[in-house]
Amino acid sequence: SPKMVQGSGCFGRKMDRISSSSGLGCKVLRRH
């Protein structure tokens, strides 16, 4: 298993924006 996993799921993909204090998270924006 990986030696380091901070964010699970989509948060782990966001290596460019792992800073969660931005409030951006990893939301998917959709038009309803």
Epitope: P2, M4, Q6, G9, C10, F11, R13, I18, G25, K27
Partner: antibody, heavy 117, light 111 residues
Framework: QIQLVQSGPELRKPGETVKISCKGS????????INWVKQTPRKDLKWMGW????????YYADDFKGRFAFSLETSANTAYLQINNLNNGDMGTYFC??????????WGQGTSVTVSS | DNVLTQSPPSLAVSLGQRATISCKAN??????????LNWYQQKPGQPPKFLIY???NLESGIPARFSGSGSGTDFNLNIHPVEEEDAATYYC?????????FGSGTKLEIK
């Protein structure tokens, strides 16, 4: 073996504050994020957000912004969840759980929070 | 939020038979060839237990009678042959986007 051990059940009055602890052992605590999950009395599971145990940065799901705070004491391998201004809707069981690449692999035993005047 | 609908809400399966639980997402949970869909088992008084990740990967220590399948929006958890100790509530969960969401659970009873 990997374990997350949480503090015991809490009984609070409306408007009070509760702070739940989650101590990790059996792995390098600062290498894995800690997520918090609420289980409602109806047994629904709600992801509250997570804290980066390396940087201390916290991310909160929209439903848990404002009165909820995640924090760390890395020297004690411990994460905390604080809930302020408690109300009846906060009743349930709170779990800390470790980040896995896809999911949430190790879970604490849960901490029951009861709010009653 | 990406709502996960589990069915059936409960089912009773005879010992040794197959249990199939469905989880349908409002929209796809795939990213770069991976499905960000996980399964958990919860017994009364215990925390959820991590069973399957990325739709079909068995977590370490989980018996091979558990299997997962699906992609996109439609996923299944299969248990075969069902054993007494499998009586529990099963939840699916997506981690493809924020907020992570769980299905409402399927309670499995062994006949």
């Amino acid at each position: 073996q990997i374990q997350l051990v949480q503090s015991g059940p809490e009984l609070r009055k409306p408007g009070e504050t509760v702070k739940i602890s989650c101590k990790g052992s059996g792995y390098t605590f600062t290498h894995y994020g800690i997520n918090w999950v609420k289980q409602t009395p109806r047994k629904d599971l709600k992801w509250m957000g997570w804290i980066n145990t390396h940087t201390g940065e916290a991310y909160y799901a929209d439903d848990f912004k404002g009165r909820f705070a995640f924090s760390l004491e890395t020297s004690a391998n411990t994460a905390y969840l604080q809930i302020n201004n408690l109300n009846n809707g906060d009743m349930g069981t709170y779990f800390c759980t470790r980040s896995h690449r896809f999911g949430l692999d190790y879970w604490g035993q849960g901490t029951s929070v009861t709010v009653s005047s | 939020d990406n709502v996960l609908t589990q069915s059936p809400p409960s089912l009773a399966v005879s010992l040794g038979q197959r249990a199939t639980i469905s989880c349908k997402a409002n929209w796809p949970v795939d990213y770069n060839g991976d499905s960000y869909l996980n399964w958990y088992q919860q017994k009364p008084g215990q925390p959820p237990k991590f069973l399957i990740y990325a739709a079909s990967n068995l977590e370490s220590g989980i018996p091979a009678r558990f299997s997962g399948s699906g992609s996109g929006t439609d996923f299944n958890l299969n248990i075969h042959p069902v054993e007494e100790e499998d009586a529990a509530t099963y939840y699916c969960q997506q981690s493809n986007e924020d907020p992570f969401t769980f299905g409402s659970g399927t309670k499995l009873e062994i006949k």
